[in-house]
């Protein structure tokens, strides 16, 4: 049997050591003890007696099935306790009585059916994070379960086999910053929602099949809900249940952000928000994020005209990796307040982008992200986007463009352009001179000779440049990142010719450690202030005797340098 390894500050690691019991020889000097991934099965009343100053105890996945009632009695300083993924089929309040300093408690993934016969947590007045429940057996939430807890930063409840929710069970916690609920279906959703309306600021619903969700008015008085964010992850919706969910929004008037992540819509987008009051109550929602939305019949999807009015005040929309091939012109025109639009990892092509960015589309748009779509022509893309009079930032990275032409048109206010990972081999005057930030990293560039008078930041890492670009091309450059190219040297003159340069990241290049380069680095201790990844990323590639040495440490041979 292996032993614990402890460092000088009392942090002890005993993970995966095949322990079959809590190891002996524990001391008061220990501050943190991790015994995860062992086969401990049992914790006796004296096993942790000596650990009076322990602040962190991690016992996850250690096959524990029995803990004596007073096993933790000496752990009054404990702040973090992780008992997740063990074999505890029942929980005892006597474990937690002495743990008055506890801030974090994870009981998730143990096969209990309830949280015990009496309240577990009345003494845990400092608790900030609580994780409970499991996938298969946790079936009942009762009113006594959360007694004594008044405020939590994070509460995560995995109740994927829930059969009974006693109303008002969650109401006793007056303030919950982030509640994550894993519910397999919507049976108790309305009851739970009513109980958390006045306490939860961010509600995250996971793995819930909402296909049969039906709204009914909540038994609550006029309530001012603090909820600002609502997220659905791994949920299933239909057109009908989406309409029903919208009706919940009348109770959360301060909601500003809605997120759908990895959800499935078994519908066609035939939404019909019947309640006209829903429209006005969506008024404060500024951010809508949709990622990996799976629509089995996406090719029959509606034009969403029924929800146009819902989204008129939204400022930020992300629809990522969801097979979007068109935002209809009339929809774009309705998005009057939209400032940020991210359509990464979709199926947009120039022909449909032209319809999406029609005259009057997205009139307030400042940032457009079209990364990893199916755009091919930089010239066409720029031309299509001329309608966006307020566009300052464009990301068209990870599209495979045809060679760049000599001239292109771009929205006149554009200041930021991301062309990284687009396969470009040459930069031409197609790139607008108005730019302040240009990202051309991860391409096939072996030179850069474009005059950009306003450029402040140039990102050109992972290319094939052999030298730093000429400083006269960028008179106001502040930041250049040119890692992982084929740069072999830089000199005092080169760096000095960038009058405003504050940050240069040039590590992981093929430096030839010549007398000149090494004497320059030795004579210039101030390099550390400008080279952000200095000295560890600056290694000699040649001559062979210095290969792999840091520039900072390499010493030129007297013979070579004084011939």
């Amino acid at each position: 049997q292996e032993s614990l390894s402890c460092d000088a500050s009392g942090v002890c690691d005993g993970r995966s050591r095949s322990f079959t019991s809590i190891p002996s020889g524990l001391t008061a000097a220990m501050k943190s003890l991790d015994l995860s991934f062992n086969k401990i099965t049992y914790i006796g009343h004296g096993d942790l007696r000596a650990c009076a100053n322990l602040q962190v105890l991690i016992l996850k996945s250690s096959r524990i099935n029995t803990i004596e009632g007073d096993a933790f009695y000496s752990l009054g300083s404990l702040e973090h306790l992780d008992l997740s993924d063990n074999h505890l089929s029942s929980l005892s309040s006597s474990w937690f009585g002495p743990l008055s300093s506890l801030k974090y408690l994870n009981l998730m993934g143990n096969p209990y059916q309830t949280l015990g016969v009496t309240s577990l947590f009345p003494n845990l007045t400092n608790l900030q994070t609580l994780r409970i429940g499991n996938v298969e057996t946790f079936s009942e939430i009762r009113r006594i379960d959360f007694a004594g807890l008044t405020s939590l930063n994070e509460l995560e409840i995995k109740a994927l086999s829930l059969r009974n929710y006693q109303s008002q069970s969650l109401k006793s916690i007056r303030d919950i910053h982030h509640l994550t609920l894993h519910l397999s279906e919507s049976a108790f959703l309305l009851e739970i929602f009513a109980d958390i309306l006045s306490s939860v600021r961010y509600l995250e619903l996971r793995d819930t099949n909402l296909a049969r969700f039906q709204f009914s008015p909540l038994p609550v008085d006029e309530v001012s809900s603090p909820m600002k964010k609502l997220a659905f992850r791994g949920s299933v919706l239909t057109d009908e249940s989406f309409n029903e969910l919208l009706k919940l929004l009348r109770y959360i008037l301060e909601l500003s952000e809605v997120e759908f992540d990895d959800c499935t819509l078994n519908g066609l987008g035939d939404f019909n928000p019947s309640e006209s009051d829903v429209v006005s109550e969506l008024g404060k929602v500024e951010t809508v994020t949709i990622r990996r939305l799976h629509i089995p019949q996406f090719y029959l999807f509606y034009d969403l005209s029924t929800v146009y009015s819902l989204l008129e005040k939204v400022k930020r929309i992300t629809v990522e990796n969801s097979k979007v091939f068109l935002v209809p012109c009339s929809f774009s025109q309705h998005l009057k307040s939209l400032e940020f639009l991210d359509l990464s990892e979709n199926l947009m092509v120039e022909e449909y982008l032209k319809n999406s960015a029609c005259k009057g589309a997205w009139p307030s748009l400042q940032t457009l992200v079209l990364s990893q779509n199916h755009l091919r022509s930089m010239q066409k893309t720029g031309e299509i986007l001329l309608t966006l009079k307020n566009l300052t930032s464009l990301d068209i990275s990870r599209n495979t463009f045809h060679p760049m032409p000599d001239s292109c048109q771009w929205p006149e206010k554009m200041r930021f352009l991301n062309l990284s990972s687009t396969g470009i081999r040459v930069v031409k005057t197609c790139i607008p001179q108005t730019l302040e930030v240009l990202d051309v990293s991860n391409n096939n560039l072996d030179s850069f000779s474009l005059f950009l008078p306003r450029l402040q930041e140039l990102y050109i890492s992972r290319n094939k440049l052999k030298t730093l670009p000429d400083a006269s091309l960028f008179p106001v450059l502040l930041v250049m990142k040119i890692r992982e190219n084929a740069v072999s040297t830089f000199s005092k003159d080169q760096l000095g010719s960038f009058p405003k340069l504050e940050t240069l990241e040039a590590g992981d290049n093929h430096f030839v450690c010549s007398c000149e380069l090494l004497s320059f680095t030795m004579e210039t201790p101030a390099l550390a202030q400008i080279l952000v990844d200095w000295p560890d990323s600056y290694l000699c590639d040649s001559p062979p005797r210095l290969h792999g040495h840091r520039l900072q440490d390499a010493r030129p041979s007297v013979l070579e340098c004084h011939q």
Partner: nanobody, 122 residues
Framework: VQLVKSGGGGLVQAGGSLRLSCAAS????????MGWFRQAPGKEREFVAV????????DYAASVKGRFTIARDNAKNTVYLEMTSLEPEDTAVYYC???????????????WGQGTPVTVSS
């Protein structure tokens, strides 16, 4: 959906590995949550692992967490269970199941495979 073909089971020594697979017929495979359950001789059927429709969420019984991995390939209509560091206590008949709900409760699964025996010898 019909769970038509299970395979990959057999006899293995303690510490060894196996990969179970379960293939479905029909075009609606990606609309189902998939789970693996097991039943040892003389014992009740118990939950092993579950995966959501896209493969983005997975959950495991505490007894297998860190040793078993569930995965799915919607293009091949197949769900897998990669089992490593096998122990004699893992000996059981393993069943795949399809349902509408992401849960470890076997009663919520509507479609079941025929079962694959796994024997782990010490």
């Amino acid at each position: 959906v019909q769970l038509v073909k299970s395979g990959g089971g057999g006899l293995v020594q303690a510490g060894g590995s196996l990969r179970l697979s379960c293939a479905a017929s029909g075009r609606t495979f990606s609309r189902y949550v998939m789970g693996w359950f097991r039943q040892a001789p003389g014992k009740e059927r118990e939950f092993v692992a579950v995966i959501n429709r896209s493969g983005g969420s997975t959950d495991y019984a505490a007894s297998v967490k860190g040793r078993f991995t569930i995965a799915r390939d919607n293009a091949k209509n197949t769900v897998y269970l990669e089992m490593t560091s096998l122990e004699p206590e893992d000996t059981a008949v393993y069943y795949c199941a399809a349902g509408e709900y992401y849960t470890g409760s076997s009663s919520r699964y509507d479609h079941w495979g025929q079962g694959t025996p796994v024997t782990v010898s010490s």
